[in-house]
Structure formats: structure tokens, C-alpha cells
């Protein structure tokens, strides 16, 4: 097995991920692993010398960079919060704060905005990944209701009057719960899913 540095006439290297072509010497040299940078460039007789990134800097990939990238905090003004800190191999991991979604994306989220409210009778469709997009409001399914304007409220099942020993005074809708009354009451009292004694 040939190890770097080795000559390459066709300007390509065997391992594209971990090696790079150095045109001045027409050789293939080792890249530096994640978390490190090139402290001494390769020559025909000596391979690349790598050094660990200093505190608060990182390189995420195999590289032949002579510097490390500066760690940046998650910007709360842009609605971002930290989920994992920066290390020498990885930039700070950020996500949108609760109740927000990513409104601007450039390789990563750069700006979050407040999620839209879902009106009564609807709820936000559950997403695979929190903070990925704005709310898409969908109607409550049959037998459920939601009576507020909220970005996060979920549709709840209608109260079953019989479970409480009551009878239905008014059916539930998508925006309101079932109204129940005492079986002995002739007129339905003004109440929702509760028993008036």
C-alpha cells in the first residue's frame, strides 16, 4: 500500500477524502482529519503535518486548510438556541427556539420567525422535524375540537357526557366541546363537559 506523499502524474489521488493533489511538487499528500489543520505543508520527502484546532475553533472535514474556522454562538436575536456546543470537529449546533420556525436557510438556519397561529377548529400538522417550517393548519378530525388561536394547541376529543352520567345538551363542533346536562334537567344549563349540581 502506497502512503503519502507519492507522485501522481494524472493529478488524482487514490483516496479523495483523505488525500489531495499538491501541484507544485506533483504529489499526493494527506489531508488533515476533522478537528485539525495543516501546521506544515507536505514536500516530496515529508507528508503533511497536522495540529489540533485551538479552543473555540474547528474544522469539520478532512482538509488542507492552514487555519481552523472560528466557533460562533447561536444568535438569540435571530431566534436560535444551542443544542450542542462547538468542538474542534464541529461548529455549534443550533435550532429555532420553541414556537419558532426557520425562515431563512443558507446551508444552515440563519433566521427564525414565530410560528403562525392555527385558528379555532384547526391544529398544526405534526412535522418530522421541529422548527423546519411554518405551521400548516389542518381541521380537527371528527369528534375533536380546538377553541383557541394558538401555534401549538392540539385538537382534543369531545367530552362523552355518558361517561360522567350526563346527557348531551348540545353536540360538539370543531370549535367547541359537547355541552352536557343532568338527566333531570329539562333545560340545558350553560356548561361545557361539566356537571352542574
Amino acid at each position: 500500500q502506497v502512503v503519502p506523499p507519492y507522485g501522481s502524474e494524472n493529478q488524482t489521488c487514490r483516496d479523495q477524502e483523505k488525500e489531495y493533489y499538491e501541484p507544485r511538487h506533483r504529489i499526493c499528500c494527506s489531508r488533515c482529519p476533522p478537528g485539525t489543520y495543516v501546521s506544515a505543508k507536505c514536500s516530496r520527502s515529508r507528508d503533511t503535518v497536522c495540529a489540533t484546532c485551538a479552543e473555540n475553533s474547528y474544522n469539520e472535514h478532512w482538509n488542507y486548510l492552514t487555519i481552523c474556522q472560528l466557533c460562533r454562538p447561536c444568535d438569540p436575536v435571530m431566534g436560535l438556541e444551542e443544542i450542542a456546543p462547538c468542538t474542534s470537529k464541529r461548529k455549534t449546533q443550533c435550532r429555532c427556539q420553541p414556537g419558532m420556525f426557520c425562515a431563512a436557510w443558507a446551508l444552515e438556519c440563519t433566521h427564525c420567525e414565530l410560528l403562525s397561529d392555527c385558528p379555532p377548529g384547526t391544529e398544526a400538522e405534526l412535522k418530522d422535524e421541529v422548527g423546519k417550517g411554518n405551521n400548516h393548519c389542518v381541521p380537527c378530525k371528527a369528534g375533536h375540537f380546538q377553541n383557541t388561536s394558538s401555534p401549538s394547541a392540539r385538537c382534543q376529543p369531545h367530552t362523552r357526557c355518558e361517561d360522567q352520567g350526563l346527557v348531551e345538551a348540545a353536540p360538539g363542533t370543531a370549535q367547541s366541546d359537547t355541552t352536557c346536562r343532568n338527566p333531570s334537567e329539562s333545560l340545558p344549563p350553560e356548561m361545557s363537559g361539566t356537571m352542574l349540581m
Epitope: P33, T52, E55, N56, A84, P85, S88
Partner: antibody, heavy 121, light 107 residues
């Protein structure tokens, strides 16, 4: 030779204190995040604490937070763990470990031989 | 906290057997996973880091595959010196967490 040597373990009563030390040699100590990991008798490994190269990033497990303090002296190539308000459940072998090529936490590539801490009345 | 579920907790195999241990993370940890070997009375020894990279000096019969939440560690041909307890560990986020360990014994 790259080496980590722990010291300072022993028998201590519940509520007592102990200070563990870890002497590093054979590598540039100031370039690596350092860590404490413990192992209770017959149990698995449990991470305790990490400290970055410049002391900016310090982390503790919930089980020791507020009781243990990690520190380092790069000039002396030494790592420390001050353990206060010790409990019976802190009884374990305590290992000093180096984070692999990182100023913050990472995989642990070099480990000490461990020092035994016994908390008992 | 990220939970690491390792299985099996113990296994018995013959010399030359292929042995596989799995480790599941409770959330995506990308490739921030390592594997350690620990022999009785000794400190753990790093075998694999960044999910699939073999530490210098570690025999090539040890290998790993996986990314995200599901990982598997394989010893292609079990040797007598491989008798030990093996641990996975995530370092995606603090608190750093280990799997419960897998004790490998000879049948």
C-alpha cells in the same frame, strides 16, 4: 510515552471530601480537553466531568453537579477533581481520560490506570 | 440526555466466530460514536472513534458501521485476547453517555 497517572483516592466518610489528581506526560497537555470517568464496582462506565483546554467549557454529569469541581493546571500538566459532600453512590474507580485531538469533549483515547474512591461510614 | 442502548448485555462465542454488538442512540448523534474494550481490572481502551475509524494499532478484525441512531460493532474472527467487555459511547452532546456494556466470553 504518553501517560496519565491518577492519585488521591482512598476511604472517606459520607459527607467528606477528597481531591483527585491526574499527572499527564508524553504529550502537550494544554492542547487537549481532559475528562473524569468513573466505574462503580461491577458496573459500567459513567462520564463525570470534562474541561476544555482553556477552561472555557466545563461540564458535569447531573449526579455530581454542585458537589464536584474539575480544574486543570496546564503549567503543571495536571488535572484535578475536587469532590465534596461525598455519598456512598460515589464509590467507584475514577479514571482520568484525554479527549482525542480535541479542545472540547470527544472520544477518550488515553486513560489512566484509575484510582479507587470508597465512601463508607 | 442521549440514551445509549447496547445489546446483547453478554454473549458467548467460539474462537474464530463473527461477533456483532449493536448500539442504539435515543436521538441522531451523526457519527460521534466510539467503542471501547475493557479487560478485568484494567482501564478501557479506545478501539473505534467517529463511528468507523480504527484507532492506531487496533487489529483490522474490529469494525463498525452505522450513522445517526443505529450502530453495530463487529469482530470478524474472535480471538482469545478479545475476551473483554465492550462499551459504546456518544460524544455528540453532554452529558456524554455510554452503553451498558457487552461482556464477550468464550463458549
Amino acid at each position: 510515552e504518553v501517560q496519565l497517572v491518577e492519585s488521591g483516592g482512598g476511604l472517606v466518610k459520607p459527607g467528606g471530601s477528597l481531591r483527585l489528581s491526574c499527572a499527564a506526560s508524553g504529550f502537550t497537555f494544554s492542547s487537549y480537553c481532559m475528562n473524569w470517568v468513573r466505574q462503580a464496582p461491577g458496573k459500567g462506565l459513567e462520564w463525570v466531568s470534562s474541561i476544555s483546554t482553556g477552561n472555557t467549557y466545563i461540564y458535569y454529569s447531573d449526579s455530581v453537579k454542585g458537589r464536584f469541581t474539575i480544574s486543570r493546571d496546564n503549567a503543571k500538566n495536571s488535572l484535578y477533581l475536587q469532590m465534596n459532600s461525598l455519598r456512598a453512590e460515589d464509590t467507584a474507580v475514577y479514571y482520568c481520560a484525554r479527549a482525542r485531538y480535541n479542545w472540547n469533549y470527544d472520544a477518550f483515547d488515553i486513560w489512566g490506570q484509575g484510582t479507587m474512591v470508597t465512601v463508607s461510614s | 440526555d442521549i440514551q445509549m442502548t447496547q445489546s446483547p448485555s453478554s454473549l458467548s462465542a467460539s474462537i474464530g466466530d463473527r461477533v456483532t454488538i449493536t448500539c442504539q442512540a435515543s436521538q441522531d448523534i451523526s457519527n460521534f460514536l466510539s467503542w471501547y474494550q475493557q479487560k478485568p481490572g484494567k482501564a478501557p481502551n479506545l478501539l473505534i472513534f467517529d463511528a468507523s475509524n480504527l484507532e492506531t494499532g487496533v487489529p483490522s478484525r474490529f469494525s463498525e458501521s452505522g450513522s445517526g441512531t443505529d450502530f453495530s460493532f463487529t469482530i470478524t474472527s474472535l480471538q482469545p485476547e478479545d475476551i473483554a467487555t465492550y462499551y459504546c459511547q456518544q460524544y455528540y452532546n453532554v452529558p456524554l453517555t455510554f452503553g451498558g456494556g457487552t461482556k464477550v466470553e468464550i463458549k
